[in-house]
């Protein structure tokens, strides 16, 4: 009893339960391949409890090995599109600070018009995590489409 | 000491592990989208720890974020089946209460014959989730091809 | 105040936080269609906390229940490539002790040259994990293409 | 013991129609998907149509699409071929056989047939 | 289509005798394959599925190997009551396709 009273007291943050979920907001200018995210609860069902967005990258605020997960699916596409404009690529990965600049989950789109994986990794407070989507074909932005996560783990 | 003795003694639910994973039941009849699940260590590996079954949906019984995963494989499907048939799209939403209603998770097979995909989202105690296939390709009932499951991440 | 430290003060491995993340080290000579995998941070990003690696192949450590994840991707492949070579199949699953041996998840590659997935599933201690890759085309070993992990949920 | 008997073949004239049906005992009969098979004498086996076991999903062979309708009653253990515009060539024994509970389309259990002769 | 070719078309051995079939898919069908047996008169019988399961009741001479687009089904000690046809058939897509089958006798 002792320890479910302590932890419905100590703030969520505290347990290290740093966890976001984003909606694609919008996509760059040329020669920018990153997306931009948003979250919050105004906007429905994204969120961000612990980590940060940082003029629409998500930035990490607790050290620890994290879940990454994403799914993108191209706007007005169909096996004949994506295979046309192949290759379609999405990477995500530390973009900064640019010492720890590393690619972490790379994905291309071939035939098909989703593309969703997810992958454990350590992330280190201040890291800032950018998707990168190569390719001529535009992101979807429907909430049930296109949608970029992460889930603290463990220290 | 103390704490982990406390762990163990505290009921599983009441630290908010609930977590379920399903396998295919069988399909709705004709103008039924619905795919039905069952769980339960007597059907295999599937199991329901919180959240229980309500005529094959899933209902949820504790209010937080939740990771949902899904994997469908179409059955008898080739690249050339799934393309001779395409659209074909699998959602995962909010079904019940019809004022929660919303998809959660949408995608297509194009040229393949297995999705698979997974996303944080808030849920609440009574949500009911469904899972809706459209087209006219039947999915597999094999419990390592097709699986539906959600695990509770945080309040 | 106490929760927390005493939360600190356990090792990691008391509160079940077992977690690995594999990068690909090679395939198997003909005829073995296993994945041999490595881990640990003079490679990179992959990790080891709790489960071993057993001659490459993934060894769980604490019972409970498992998300296990895996993306591989085909290297020098495109969808002309992958249709060409199909089917190529991945499929995880437990593979000893013998007794226990069964498919976890499988997946086909069709026209595309990458697979992702994840499910949940229970694990025992001693069950060691094998990945099948059966088809004519090599996995890349790019870290960010082809990875393999396990994440302890509960008991 | 599974058990699979099919009824309402015989001889129909070029163009016309028959109603086949296969009664099923010994097994859930909603919980899996179901086939024809038809083999025409000293020839080899050809797959006719599948449906899923709970009638959402249905296949046919490029040969009978537009003549053959496969329909099912769970509630009475049955499967049924309905076959209009019948042509010499659809003449054979055909077979009423049980899908694998998995949904895939191997057949292990097969009734013992009934013969379709088209003639005029 | 899926074409599935059988060879031989039939063959001819001795009691005891290793016998193998092989049907070849004309594209790749990964193991969605089943094996039939086909007795005189009768109706068609299950031996294997998934290209190398056994099926229940059949007997552990019946073996099956392959994947992708060749495969074999070996009886290691042929027996007078395995005289008959064996169908190859593919459920990887439709349409469902067999062999033409293969013809054992005894000689």
């Known amino acids: 009893q002792r320890f479910a009273q302590a932890q419905q007291q100590l703030p969520l943050e505290s347990l290290g339960w740093d966890v976001a979920e984003l909606q694609l907001n919008h996509t760059g200018p040329q020669q920018d391949p990153r997306l931009y995210w948003q979250g919050g609860p105004a906007l429905g069902r994204s969120f961000l409890h612990g980590p940060e967005l940082d003029k629409g990258q998500l930035r990490i605020h607790r050290d620890g090995i994290y879940m990454v997960h994403i799914q993108v699916t191209l706007a007005i596409c169909s096996s004949t599109t994506a295979s046309r404009h192949h290759p379609t690529t999405l990477a995500v990965g530390i973009c900064s600070p640019a010492s720890r600049s590393i690619s972490l989950l790379r994905l291309s789109f071939h035939q098909g018009c989703t593309i969703a994986s997810q992958r454990l990794t350590p992330l280190a407070r201040g890291d800032t995590l950018c998707t990168n989507l190569t390719g001529t074909l535009l992101p979807s932005r429907n909430t049930d489409e296109t949608f970029f996560g992460v889930q603290w783990v463990r220290p | 000491q103390r704490f982990a003795q406390a762990q163990q003694q505290l009921p599983l639910e009441s630290l908010g592990w609930d977590v379920a994973e399903l396998q295919l039941n069988h399909t709705g009849p004709q103008q039924d989208p619905r795919l039905y699940w069952q769980g339960g260590p007597a059907l295999g590996r599937s199991f329901l720890h919180g959240p229980e079954l309500d005529k094959g949906q899933l209902r949820i019984h504790r209010d937080g974020i939740y990771m949902v995963h899904i994997q469908v494989t179409l059955a008898i499907c080739s690249s050339t089946t799934a393309s001779r048939h395409h659209p074909t799209t699998l959602a995962v939403g909010i079904c019940s209460p019809a004022s929660r209603s919303i998809s959660l998770l949408r995608l297509s097979f194009h040229q393949g014959c297995t999705i698979a995909s997974q996303r944080l989202t808030p849920l609440a105690r009574g949500d009911t989730l469904c899972t809706n296939l459209t087209g006219t390709l039947l999915p597999s009932r094999n419990t390592d091809e097709t699986f539906f499951g959600v695990q509770w991440v945080r309040p | 105040q106490r929760f927390a430290q005493a939360q600190q003060q356990l090792p990691l491995e008391s509160l079940g936080w077992d977690v690995a993340e594999l990068q690909l080290n090679h395939t198997g000579p003909q005829q073995d269609p296993r994945l041999y995998w490595q881990g640990g941070p003079a490679l990179g990003r992959s990790f080891l906390h709790g489960p071993e690696l057993d001659k490459g192949q993934l060894r769980i450590h604490r019972d409970g229940i498992y998300m296990v994840h895996i993306q591989v991707t085909l290297a020098i492949c495109s969808s002309t490539t992958a249709s060409r070579h199909h089917p190529t199949t991945l499929a995880v699953g437990i593979c000893s002790p013998a007794s226990r041996s069964i498919s976890l998840l499988r997946l086909s590659f069709h026209q595309g040259c990458t697979i992702a997935s994840q499910r949940l599933t229970p694990l025992a201690r001693g069950d060691t994990l094998c990945t099948n890759l059966t088809g004519t085309l090599l996995p890349s070993r790019n870290t960010d293409e082809t990875f393999f992990g396990v994440q302890w949920v509960r008991p | 013991e599974v058990q699979l008997v099919e009824s309402g073949g015989g001889l129909v004239k070029p163009g016309g129609s028959l109603r086949l049906s296969c009664a099923a005992s010994g097994f859930t009969f909603s919980s899996y998907s179901m086939n024809w098979v038809r083999q025409a004498p000293g020839k080899c086996l050809e797959w006719v149509s599948y449906i899923s076991s709970s009638g959402g999903y249905i296949y046919y062979a490029e040969s009978v699409k537009g003549r053959f309708t496969i329909s099912r009653d769970n509630a009475k253990n049955s499967l049924y071929l309905q076959m209009n515009s019948l042509r010499a060539e659809d003449a054979a024994v055909y077979y009423c056989?049980?899908?694998?509970?998995?949904?895939?389309?191997?057949?292990?259990?097969w009734g013992q047939g009934t013969l379709v002769t088209v003639s005029s | 289509d899926i074409q599935m070719t059988q060879s031989p078309s039939s063959l001819s051995a001795s009691v005891g005798d290793r016998v193998t079939i092989t049907c070849r898919a004309s594209?790749?069908?990964?193991?969605?394959l089943a094996w039939y047996q086909q007795k005189p008169g009768k109706v068609p019988k299950l031996l294997i599925y998934a290209a190398s399961t056994l099926q229940s009741g059949v007997p552990s001479r019946f073996s099956g190997s392959g994947s992708g687009t060749d495969f074999t089904l070996t009886i290691s000690s042929l027996q007078a009551e395995d005289v008959a046809v064996y169908y190859c058939q593919q459920y990887y897509s439709t349409p469902l396709t067999f062999g033409c089958g293969t013809k054992v006798e005894i000689k």
């Open positions: 056989s049980r899908g694998d509970y998995s949904n895939y389309a191997y057949f292990d259990y």
């Open positions: 594209q790749g069908i990964s193991n969605y």
